[in-house]
Amino acid sequence: VTCDDYYYGFGCNKFCRPRDDFFGHYACDQNGNKTCMEGWMGPECNRAICRQGCSPKHGSCKLPGDCRCQYGWQGLYCD
């Protein structure tokens, strides 16, 4: 059985479309599971992995490896 584009698995009922945009950064494995690109995490691979040590409470990042501080916090790790 050959599945339609972006459909995977037995019965072709698993859907996965690789993407690299605001809504996700992932490839699809042979079973149609999302595999996050380097630097991204979460079920949809749309959450950047911040600089190692970046304060989870006072820092955040839009892009992998970044660490942007909340107002009132500073330093390499916003701590």
Partner: antibody
Framework: QVQLVQSGAEVKKPGSSVKVSCKAS????????MHWVRQAPGQGLEWMGA????????AYAQKFQGRVTLTADKSTSTAYMELSSLRSEDTAVYYC????????????WGQGTLVTVSS | DIQMTQSPSSLSASVGDRVTITCRAS??????LAWYQQKPGKAPKLLIY???TLADAVPSRFSGSGSGTDYTLTISSLQPEDFATYYC?????????FGGGTKLEIK
């Protein structure tokens, strides 16, 4: 279970701004974008934009670029939509909405917030 | 931007009828299409996603089909609770635009 609870109805003057909140519960707030969709009285649905609460990244429909600001407060799991320079045609119900698991489109919706713009 | 054209804009039918609503995209959306049902004063409810997959707890009388640019929502046997407005929406790339809606009314 996933719940999105929005702030109450607002009446605003033309030229002013409105800020609508959407409190999320039942899932990890930073794992999914929060989208905003509006519906004018008797009209269809219009996608306005989305925010990734984890890092604050945003995507906006071109029509609203520069007039809408999406923000998120991770500490309270609350997303906000602020619309400025209001005009009468912005009178609408504003919904926050979230994708489902496994790339569903909008499986979860807030109850909607009616914003009335009138002089 | 991809535009969605939905037809008809309104439709009168009777309980038990088979009803078809169509949606055409201005570009290939590769099955990245959803259908929603909306009742007055309520938020839309997801019916179908990825063109043909039924969302949780949606009755099997609803079905979706299509590919490329042309998609169809079919209700095999209308029930009284099905009278509502239906919207298609693509989610291939931002902006995730909706069709104009189809108001399904009792004949």
């Amino acid at each position: 279970q996933v719940q999105l609870v929005q702030s109450g109805a607002e009446v605003k003057k033309p030229g002013s701004s409105v800020k609508v909140s959407c409190k999320a519960s039942g899932y990890t707030f930073t794992d999914y974008e929060m989208h905003w969709v509006r519906q004018a009285p008797g009209q269809g649905l219009e996608w306005m934009g989305a925010i990734q609460p984890g890092g604050g990244g945003t995507a906006y429909a071109q029509k609203f670029q520069g007039r809408v600001t999406l923000t998120a407060d991770k500490s309270t799991s609350t997303a906000y939509m602020e619309l400025s320079s209001l005009r009468s045609e912005d009178t609408a119900v504003y919904y926050c909405t979230r994708r489902g698991y496994d790339d569903y489109p909008f499986a979860y919706w807030g109850q909607g917030t009616l914003v009335t713009v009138s002089s | 931007d991809i535009q969605m054209t939905q037809s008809p804009s309104s439709l009168s039918a009777s309980v038990g009828d088979r009803v078809t609503i169509t949606c055409r995209a201005s570009g290939n959306i590769h099955n990245y299409l959803a259908w929603y049902q909306q009742k007055p004063g309520k938020a839309p409810k997801l019916l179908i996603y990825n063109a043909k997959t039924l969302a949780d707890a949606v009755p099997s009388r609803f079905s979706g089909s299509g590919s490329g640019t042309d998609y169809t929502l079919t209700i095999s046997s209308l029930q009284p609770e099905d009278f509502a407005t239906y919207y298609c929406q693509h989610f291939w790339s931002a902006p995730w635009t909706f069709g104009g809606g189809t108001k399904l009314e009792i004949k």
